[in-house]
């Protein structure tokens, strides 16, 4: 039994003090308008469906419906006393998408459809989303609409981010198989694409896939191995979406950045973070890049987004995602360097300039300071007990460094008898010496390693 307090107010005239379910009349198995409580709130009755009359003797509206008099005031005891009939109107007025893939004008219509479905012993129709099927719910006042500035940036730049795949031919069957992939971004409407040099090589077929799934054969236009930047070109009819280069020199530590790539067909990978350091000396990071500064970020850079753009919140490219050192430390080639490369590339192709050779051993490194050593020690328990030297971030395969036996996480502490305090010291020795007899701290043991630099085109 329900006490009067448990019932909806106001009470209709002639309601009992206590509800007695036994006195409730039997109800049909199915109600077109759904079930509702009677005027006293005691018995479950069939509610009037949407659009049916309510109030007076007509009884209550079904679930989710309210009784509204013609001029729009919800029916109440006052209305009833005035002896005016109302209409059952859905309390919710926005469209909804049902699990049957149909769009309903409101929630009540979906519920009615669900009841019909169950009557036919079919599955009930449930609400999949607010708004029509096949379209997102755009509520400009929702928090996610107002504050998802990262998603806004991604939406803006994604069409210009491409997936790059390299193929080789098997020696006898001549079948083409994929050998590597990465990302890139379009910088000109006629199909010039920037990526990392390590993503592409001249001897392989390079295939580019756009966001819309269209694929193209790409030609390698220019490569700067030292800076790890490559320019490739696709032939496309019509204008392509492009990304504009921002000024990396104006970046501030703490600024939001978004790293985006296209590791798989038709998919983007997005990571976000802040700028940790705007001018990490390139000599500290790698000999290919000894005259260049890097942007350090905590946005995750990995194989998936390598070669893709690092953008600011205006969607301008402020770097090329290039390498990850360890969790939370990643690097990007600054956009000012990309601009320089594109300008020089234009000049080179116009004039066919000769390029001088550089010495190279194939490592990326950074100067070890006591604070950086502490940071690395916190991340890796077995990190060597050293507070200065050149810390090896990466050993590039098939290079003198790898051949000599250098490994990731080694710390170079001396070369040819001279102590190494920073990565610059290593860069300087490479320029001068043809053989490098290194003492390397690996874990807590000192190892002798010989590396013979090779000459490469910059």
């Amino acid at each position: 039994q329900l006490s009067r307090a448990g019932r909806s107010a106001p009470l209709a005239a002639g309601c009992p003090d206590r509800c007695e379910p036994a006195r409730c009349p039997p109800q049909p198995e199915h109600c077109e308008g759904g079930r509702a409580r009677d005027a006293c709130g005691c018995c479950e009755v069939c509610g009037a469906p949407e659009g049916a009359a309510c109030g007076l003797q007509e009884g209550p509206c079904g679930e989710g419906l309210q009784c509204v008099v013609p001029f729009g005031v919800p029916a109440s005891a006052t209305v009833r006393r005035r002896a005016q009939a109302g209409l059952c109107v859905c309390a919710s007025s926005e469209p909804v998408c049902g699990s049957d893939a149909n769009t309903y004008a409101n929630l009540c219509q979906l519920r009615a459809a669900s009841r019909r479905s169950e009557r036919l012993h079919r599955p009930p129709v449930i609400v999949l989303q607010r708004g029509a099927c096949g379209q997102g719910q755009e509520d400009p006042n929702s928090l996610r609409h107002k504050y998802n500035f990262i998603a806004d940036v991604v939406e803006k730049i994604a069409p210009a981010v491409v997936h790059i795949e390299l193929f080789r031919k098997l020696p006898f069957s001549k079948r083409e198989v994929p050998v590597a992939s990465g990302s890139g971004f379009i910088v000109s409407e006629d199909g010039l694409i920037v990526t990392n040099a390590h993503v592409v090589t001249n001897k392989h077929r390079v295939k580019v896939e756009l966001k819309n799934g269209a694929t193209y054969e790409a030609k390698i236009k220019d490569v700067d191995e030292k800076a790890d930047i490559a320019l490739i070109k696709i032939d496309h009819q019509g204008k392509l979406p492009v990304l504009l280069l921002g000024r990396s020199s104006e970046l501030r530590p703490g600024e939001f950045v978004v790293a985006i790539g296209s590791p798989f067909s038709l998919q983007n990978t997005v990571t976000t973070g802040i700028v940790s350091t705007t001018q990490r000396g390139g000599k500290e990071l790698g000999l290919r890049n000894s005259d260049m500064d890097y942007i350090q970020t905590d946005a995750i850079i990995n194989y998936g987004n390598s070669g893709g753009p690092l953008v600011n919140l205006d969607g301008e490219v402020i770097g090329i995602n290039t390498l990850k050192v360890t969790a939370g430390i990643s690097f990007a080639i600054p956009s000012d360097k990309i601009k320089k490369f594109l300008t020089e590339s234009h000049d080179r192709q116009a004039k066919g300039k000769a390029i001088t050779k550089k010495k190279y051993i194939g490592i990326r490194m950074m100067s070890l300071t006591s604070s950086k050593a502490k940071e690395l020690k916190d991340r890796h328990r077995d990190f060597p007990d050293v507070i200065s030297g050149a810390y090896i971030i990466e050993v590039i395969p098939d290079t003198p460094a790898e051949a000599g036996g250098l490994k990731e996480n080694d710390v170079i502490i001396s070369i040819n008898g001279q102590s190494v305090v920073s990565a610059n010291d290593v860069s300087d020795v490479i320029k001068r010496e043809s053989t490098l007899n290194m003492v390397v701290r690996r874990g807590n043991e000192d190892i002798m390693i010989t590396v013979i630099p090779e000459e490469i085109d910059p």
Epitope: L170, S173, V177, V179, P397
Partner: antibody
């Protein structure tokens, strides 16, 4: 890491056939051709042939056509070489070896080798 | 077929000594490959594309040459370098040299 595990040593009668196996692991089996090489003290290392595991396409050294048949099973990442009408000349160590390539686009070579299967043909 | 002739067939060297072996080709090839094989073991790739060291190979090994003449050099012989060395080319199909057996003095 890449591994090629070959079947054990075989002692067979002249005139018989034998099927050697090579199970690959640590890489995508269908992305590389599998090759077979014969080694004897007299003739040294000799290339027998190759198979593309994806298509089953084969290439043979003219010298071994009719002697060797190469097959591959993608589901088990295993390459096979059947040698028929065996004679004492077929006694050798047989290696399966994966075709390698230079990322910078040089030529082809053999970057990983099985441990070898010793075949002895004797009555 | 392209024939590779290695010389010498057998040689010996003292620890620390420089060692050079050659591979002569019957007609010009673009690249040469070198393998090391120790008794009871499979061949191991040492040098690819004439002069590139394979992963894990000590820098004392180096390769050079072009056309029909190629060589493998060990700058300072070590006891563990005692093995048989094979050159290999791959034009229409792969062929190997007869090998150079290197012994330690």
């Amino acid at each position: 890491q890449v591994q090629l595990q070959q079947s054990g040593a075989e002692l067979v009668r002249p005139g018989a056939s034998v099927k050697l196996s090579c199970k690959a692991s640590g890489y995508t089996f269908t992305d590389y051709e599998m090759h077979w090489v014969k080694q004897t003290p007299v003739h040294g290392l000799e290339w027998i042939g190759a198979i593309d595991p994806e298509t089953g396409g084969t290439a043979y050294n003219q010298k071994f056509k009719g002697k060797a048949t190469l097959t591959a099973d993608k589901s088990s990442s295993t390459a096979y070489m059947e040698l028929r009408s065996l004679t004492s000349e077929d006694s050798a160590v047989y290696y399966c070896t994966r075709e390698g390539y230079s990322y910078d686009g040089g030529g082809y070579y053999f970057d990983y080798w099985g441990q070898g299967t010793t075949l002895t043909v004797s009555s | 077929q392209i024939v590779l002739t290695q010389s010498p067939a057998i040689m010996s060297a003292s620890p620390g000594e420089k060692v050079t072996m050659t591979c002569s080709v019957s007609s010009s090839v673009s690249y040469m490959y070198w393998y090391q094989q120790k008794p009871g073991s499979s061949p191991r790739l040492l040098i690819y594309d004439t002069s590139n060291l394979a992963s894990g190979v000590p820098v004392r090994f180096s390769g050079s040459g072009s056309g029909t003449s190629y060589s493998l050099t060990i700058s300072r012989m070590e006891a563990e370098d005692a093995a048989t060395y094979y050159c290999q080319q791959w034009s229409s199909y792969p062929t190997f040299g007869g090998g150079t057996k290197l012994e330690i003095k």
